[in-house]
Each structure stands twice: as structure tokens, then as C-alpha cells.
């Protein structure tokens, strides 16, 4: 819509709306994956740099997160992942480059990689939500 502000210009109130939409999607995806893949450990080789360090309060680093969700999409619940990608796209700064992420070829490592992404993303959303709720922006 022509009314809509460019996505990188959304105010904290709208960012908060998007985070509120993302939280149950992320939580549900993580819980379902944990039930389906019991006994898979978290990988210590994957670090999702999900927060920007250049803004106060921290901003969700959508451009860094999106490639991971695009990468795990074929291997997870596509419907939920698509909804997450749609929300993350709204938070993305225009013209920010996206790096390409490759998923580990080994099945067990791949499962561990996916679990780690989902866990770190959920924690990240919690962190951003808390910062948006803690007084003046």
C-alpha cells in the first residue's frame, strides 16, 4: 500500500506488533521440532547474530536471520517458516545484503543446526520484546 512507511522506517509500536506475531510462530515451531527430534543436542558451532549492535534498544537483525530460515525451510514446517519469513521481511532494512547459508550435509548435524537456529531465534525475540517493553524507546 502507498500508505505504508518503508519497512526500515517502522516505529517501535509496529516493531512490537511484528514481534508479538513472531513469538507464537517461533515458539510453536521450536516445540514441534523438539517433540519430533528428541535427543538432538544444540550445536555449539552455530551462532545466530540476531541483534544489531548499532542501535539502542537492540533491533532484530532481520537480514542476518532471514538466510537461516530460507535455508531450513525445505527441512522444516514450510507453512510456519513462510509466515516467519513474511514477518521478518517487514523488519528488514531496504538494500541490506543477505548472505547465503548452507545447511550441514550430515543428517544429525543438520538436525542440530535447525534446533539451534530455532532456540536462538526464540531467545532473541524474547530479548527484543523485553527491550521494547522497558520504558521509553
Amino acid at each position: 500500500s502507498s500508505h505504508m512507511a518503508p519497512t526500515h522506517q517502522l516505529p517501535p509500536s509496529d516493531v512490537r506488533k511484528i514481534i508479538l506475531e513472531l513469538q507464537p510462530l517461533s515458539r510453536g515451531l521450536l516445540e514441534d521440532y523438539q517433540k519430533k527430534e528428541t535427543g538432538v543436542p544444540e550445536s555449539n558451532r552455530t551462532l545466530l547474530l540476531c541483534l544489531t549492535s548499532d542501535s539502542q534498544p537492540p533491533r532484530l537483525n532481520s537480514s542476518a536471520i532471514l538466510p537461516y530460515f530460507r535455508a531450513i525451510r525445505p527441512l522444516s514446517d514450510k507453512n510456519i517458516i513462510d509466515k516467519i519469513i513474511e514477518q521478518l521481511d517487514k523488519l528488514k532494512f531496504q538494500h541490506e545484503p543477505e548472505t547465503e547459508i548452507s545447511v550441514p550435509a550430515d543428517t544429525f548435524e543438520c538436525k542440530s543446526f535447525i534446533l539451534t537456529i530455532l532456540q536462538q531465534f526464540s531467545a532473541c525475540l524474547e530479548s527484543v520484546f523485553k527491550s521494547l517493553n522497558s520504558g521509553p524507546q
Epitope: S1, H3, M4, A5, P6, T7, H8, Q9, L10, P11, P12, S13, D14, R16, K17, I18, L20, E21, P24, K90, P136, Q137
Partner: antibody
């Protein structure tokens, strides 16, 4: 043309619950954000909260313990419930649409006047 | 919460003259050069009507007599020239931060 129409009781007893309906035509409540706002006697306005296209709700912290916003997508209606009302909740209650991020509430209902009195 | 202070509370203007309404936020409502401040008009017994969004953008169907300006914390709604149909109460509100907050309103009358 988008239209929002508020309905509900005009008189509520102190300590009781207030339940209002917003009936939406011309747009689906499964897109955008659907808000409740109230205007007190003397014209002071208060933002109450919303229900989103996906059913997520968010409330003004000043009302959080008493407010519930819900919806029925089959009727294209959303609802406001306010519990433990006092005379301070006497106001005109409006529903409004917030369709796009970074925009503004573009359509409002006409409002429904609610008096809390015994 | 961001406090919105609107002035004057009432305004009496002659037909054809300019009406100016101010709104001040207790903190900036800007992000990346955009101001999340909006103005609407309410006539007795009618739905509130959006006039200006994001400080200076005229809503579709609103006459060009209405204009908005300002950034940061200080904003102005201008009606020039005022017509008889403009008798109403005008409100500002911010959608920058939750909870959204409103100005106290300005009642415009014709002299």
C-alpha cells in the same frame, strides 16, 4: 467502503462486566489490526488495545488485568470485554481499523456510549 | 507513556481565515526521519475522520485546505481557509510507541 459499527449495553452496573461488539463490513478482520479506543466525558481519549489479523491481542498496561479482546471471524466481528467496571469506565467506546504498518487508524465506528451506574 | 499536549482547547476563527492547532509530544515521535503523529476530525454524532497521517500526509479525499507540519515533538495542523463545514473537534495522536496516546482536542468554532 469499510464500515465499523459498535453495539452493546448502554448501562452497566458497577462491579459488572461490559461487553461490546464491533461489526465490520467492507474488510476482513483476518487482515490488519482491530483496535478499541474510548473517550471519557470531557473528551480525553484512551487507547485500549487490539486484536490482530492472526488473533494476537495486546492491551494498554493500564487496563491489562481487566480487558479481553476476542473475535469471531465467521461473523467478521470483534469484541471488547471489560471486567470489574466502575463509574470511571463511563465513556464512548470506539472501534477502529489499523490496516498498514506505519500508517494510522483510517476507519472508525461512530462510537457507543456506556454509562456505569447503579 | 508519551504525553500529548494540544493547544488551544478551543479556537474561534472567521470564515476564510486560517486556523492553527498545535500538538506537542513529551518525547520525539520520529524514527528514521518519519514522524508518527496523526490528526483527525470529529463532528458531533459522527465517526472520527483521519485528515493527516505521519505529520504531513493528506489522507485521500481530504481537501487541500488541511495541512500538517512538524517533526520530533512539535506538530501543527493548519486549516486555510476555514469553511463553515470545518466546525468540529480536532485531535492529534501518536502511534510511535505503545500505548498510543492522544491530545486533549481542540474545538473549532466560527466567529
Amino acid at each position: 467502503e469499510v464500515q465499523l459499527v459498535e453495539s452493546g449495553p448502554s448501562l452497566v452496573k458497577p462491579g459488572g462486566s461490559l461487553r461490546l461488539t464491533c461489526s465490520v463490513t467492507g474488510d476482513s478482520i483476518t487482515s490488519g489490526y482491530w483496535k478499541w479506543i474510548r473517550k471519557f466525558p470531557g473528551n480525553k481519549l484512551e487507547y485500549m488495545g487490539y486484536i490482530s489479523y492472526s488473533g494476537i491481542t495486546d492491551y494498554n498496561p493500564s487496563l491489562k488485568s481487566r480487558i479481553t479482546i476476542s473475535r469471531d471471524t465467521s461473523k467478521n466481528q470483534y469484541y471488547l470485554q471489560l471486567n470489574s467496571v466502575t463509574t470511571e469506565d463511563t465513556a464512548t467506546y470506539y472501534c477502529a481499523r489499523y490496516a498498514n504498518y506505519g500508517y494510522a487508524m483510517d476507519y472508525w465506528g461512530q462510537g457507543t456510549s456506556v454509562t456505569v451506574s447503579s | 507513556d508519551i504525553v500529548m499536549t494540544q493547544s488551544p482547547a478551543s479556537l474561534s476563527v472567521s470564515l476564510g481565515q486560517r486556523a492553527t492547532i498545535s500538538c506537542r509530544a513529551s518525547e520525539s515521535v520520529d524514527t528514521y526521519g518519519r514522524s508518527f503523529m496523526h490528526w483527525y476530525q470529529q463532528k458531533p454524532g459522527q465517526s472520527p475522520k483521519l485528515l493527516i497521517y505521519r505529520a504531513s500526509n493528506l489522507e485521500s479525499g481530504i481537501p487541500a485546505r488541511f495541512g500538517g507540519s512538524g517533526s520530533g515533538t512539535d506538530f501543527t495542523l493548519t486549516i486555510d481557509p476555514v469553511q463553515a463545514d470545518d466546525v468540529a473537534t480536532y485531535y492529534c495522536y501518536q502511534s510511535y510507541e505503545d500505548p498510543w496516546t492522544f491530545g486533549g482536542g481542540t474545538k473549532l468554532e466560527i466567529k
